[in-house]
């Protein structure tokens, strides 16, 4: 039968940032196509990306239904042009993904400093509350909505004239820090989920410095 030419998918890998979640696999298809199925541990299988020649499948719509669930996906291989064919055991070839729990494993996207404002010797730094694709009541939730107090931000700040980075932390999206009068400071933030053991931190935000247009200075 034609199935002798189909090969099972391998290297199934979850790629997920701020809950945007894609399953990737190998190999690039030669005379075959793939279909993906996803389910929770206790749920039914749902098919996605039917008979595709891609080696990735966006599963975001499924995992955002409950980001605290653990998901399993599998990739079926079919001969191109003969998708009804099955393997020698009467089943198409398939390979299982590793388990994936979005809440515990999605990567934290690079944060952005929304603004900073100096009032005397205090600076208020605000981090943009990034929107995710997780919905509640037909509304997209922000990262803070989803993670609540599990998510903290670390602010690194330093005088433009020095290299040592001081740190501050918040479980909101705002920092209020003390600065020296007459000094310009630079800022970078990092998202952190301290309760995690893997994927704990985001990459750093772009650096923003006082004297640039994002900030505002008020002498009190």
């Amino acid at each position: 039968s034609g199935t002798t030419n189909t090969v099972a998918a391998y290297n199934l890998t979850w790629k997920s940032t701020n809950f945007k979640t894609i399953l990737e696999w190998e190999p690039k298809p030669v005379n075959q196509v793939y279909t993906v199925q996803i389910s929770t541990k206790s749920g039914d299988w749902k098919s996605k990306c039917f008979y595709t020649t891609d080696t990735e499948c966006d599963l975001t719509d499924e995992i955002v239904k409950d980001v605290k669930q653990t998901y399993l996906a599998r990739v079926f291989s079919y001969p191109a042009g003969n998708v009804e064919s099955t393997g020698s055991a009467g089943e198409p070839l398939y390979e299982n993904s590793p388990e994936f729990t979005p809440y515990l494993e999605t990567n934290l996207g690079q944060p952005t400093i929304q603004s900073f404002e100096q009032v005397g010797t205090k600076v208020n730094v605000t981090v943009e509350d990034e929107r995710t694709l997780v919905r509640r009541n037909n509304t997209f939730l922000s990262l803070r909505d989803v993670f609540g107090k599990d998510l903290i931000y670390t602010l690194y700040y330093w005088k433009s004239s020095s290299s040592g980075k001081k740190t501050a932390k918040t479980n909101t999206n705002e920092f209020l820090i003390d600065v020296d009068k007459g000094e310009n400071y630079c800022f970078s933030v990092q998202a952190v989920i301290p309760s995690r053991t893997v994927n704990r931190k985001s990459t750093d935000s772009p650096v923003e410095c006082m004297g640039q247009e994002k900030g505002e200075f008020r002498e009190i």
């Epitope: 670390t154 290299s163 040592g164 980075k165 932390k169 970078s188 301290p194 994927n199 931190k201 990459t203």
Partner: antibody, heavy 120, light 107 residues
């Protein structure tokens, strides 16, 4: 099991240099902050400096600024403390410690310490 | 830098005693205070974090509290293995700073 193991301590003359290592196992250092803390004989704990291995950011105590440098090699899962221009008052047990980077940032795991003696 | 003033510097107590150690921060540190126990020749061990949270595996006779900028470590009933030196630490701002330590000795 989370473990931090310091090495590289020893006897060095004033003005000399020494490099301490802090080898981590059971976790990935790039997900945490690593601090160095020292304790002179019979004295209390003194914070030396930190590194965030994910971005290389550091900060030092005034007492060591310009003389000590903290670095990290994430491929080796190891942090380092390079100590130059050593003085008698740098004599201490040096510990590395992991900062869980939570709001209160406690140092939840510590190494066993390595003794640095600066003497002629 | 924030100063952490710890008292007393030493105390003598008996097994079963209630022991209280205090630390005062020179400015607001919110709840970003930890307490450590250190025995001779050993590394410090975390006991309390965020002012009042008991670290995993630490006996429940240890507790921490906060009142403004004053922080307290209490050992409700001192055990033989509790004779050690105790340090508070703030990490609200950089640099983190330690108290001077309190040595708990056998009376």
């Amino acid at each position: 099991e989370v473990q931090l193991v310091e090495s590289g301590g020893g006897l060095v003359q004033p003005g000399g240099s020494l490099r301490l290592s802090c080898a981590a196992s059971g976790f990935t250092i790039s997900g945490y902050i690593i601090h160095w803390v020292r304790q002179a004989p019979g004295k209390g704990l003194e914070w030396v400096g930190y590194i965030d291995p994910s971005n290389g950011y550091t900060y030092y105590a005034d007492s060591v600024k310009g003389r000590f440098t903290i670095s990290a090699d994430t491929s080796k899962n190891t942090a380092y403390l390079q100590m130059n221009s050593l003085r008698a008052e740098d004599t201490a047990v040096y510990y590395c410690a992991r900062d869980d980077q939570s709001l209160s940032s406690p140092f939840d795991y510590w190494g066993q310490g390595t003794l640095v003696t600066v003497s002629s | 830098d924030i100063q952490m003033t710890q008292s007393p510097s030493s105390l003598s107590a008996s097994v079963g005693d209630r022991v209280t150690i205090t630390c005062r921060a020179s400015q607001d540190v919110n709840t970003a205070v930890a307490w450590y126990q250190q025995k001779p020749g050993k590394a410090p061990k975390l006991l309390i974090y965020s002012a009042s949270f008991l670290y995993s595996g630490v006996p429940s006779r240890f507790s921490g509290s906060r009142s403004g900028t004053d922080f307290t470590l209490t050992i409700s009933s001192l055990q033989p293995e509790d004779f050690a030196t105790y340090y508070c630490q703030q990490h609200y701002t950089t640099p983190p700073t330690f108290g001077q330590g309190t040595k708990v000795e056998i009376k």
